[in-house]
Amino acid sequence: ESALITQQDLAPQQRAAPQQKRSSPSEGLCPPGHHISEDGRDCISCKYGQDYSTHWNDLLFCLRCTRCDSGEVELSPCTTTRNTVCQCEEGTFREEDSPEMCRKCRTGCPRGMVKVGDCTPWSDIECVHKESGTKHSGEVPAVEETVTSSPGTPASPCSLSG
């Protein structure tokens, strides 16, 4: 009657291997680092470096770890309870509205503007008009001043879910 996933539906590395640790669910849920069996009777541990779960859950399989793309550095590895944390390499950044790729930071501000913010893994350099102090939209300028910036030091990681 129940249309639940079968072990055959899972990728080979997601199949419950006999050596995986099992425990009983609590209130029908399994702890972080585990997923539930199809019949709801067992909690099965995720595989370190392969998959994970972050909360108490009744997932039928753990979530696949993110692999950092080229152009990204791995800040912390995937564990059974936390996904990989990836960050753009120095000199590149990831915007919220285009999270799929790291973009090169601009090397300087357009004429008539001054740099007030460095390139970080999550933002381009920030430019403001010399007189008014208003921010530049972030479009790549047609003409750049010779003022260049060195990539900023990351202040905190930019986590990606897989």
Partner: nanobody, 126 residues
Framework: EVQLVESGGGSVQAGDSLRLSCAAS????????VGWFRQTPGKEREFVAA????????YYADSVKGRFTISRDNAKNTVYMQMASLKPEDTAVYYC???????????????????WGQGTQVTVSS
């Protein structure tokens, strides 16, 4: 890949009923419990109801208890939410969710979910 597809939203008058459906377009919901959340502009998603697809156990937010009924049809891989005695404050985008996430095992209200549908708008006018 788990994909959830909602349907059944629409515009109704206060006191009317609607039935929302959530179908797993893959072969699985990816979890035993499936739930509904709702969201109004500028507010966080709010848990509405959930059901255990194995044994039919149900969970409801206090705000909808006695008015909304969640059910499942495992053969059709679909979860339903019958919404009765609708109020203007029920106006929201309703999301089907699976892989419900809880901070503690004893919690009745999930803090989020792994898998989400695209949402269906429900508008209740007075």
């Amino acid at each position: 890949e788990v994909q959830l597809v909602e349907s059944g939203g629409g515009s109704v008058q206060a006191g009317d009923s609607l039935r929302l459906s959530c179908a797993a377009s893959g072969r699985t919901f990816g979890s035993i419990r499936v739930g509904w959340f709702r969201q109004t502009p500028g507010k966080e998603r709010e848990f509405v109801a959930a059901i255990n697809r194995n044994d039919g156990t149900t969970y409801y937010a206090d705000s909808v208890k006695g008015r909304f009924t969640i059910s499942r049809d495992n053969a059709k891989n679909t979860v339903y939410m019958q919404m009765a005695s609708l109020k203007p404050e029920d106006t929201a985008v309703y999301y089907c969710a699976a892989g419900l996430q809880y901070n503690r095992s004893a919690d009745r209200v999930p803090v989020g979910a792994v898998y989400w549908g695209q949402g269906t708008q429900v508008t209740v006018s007075s």
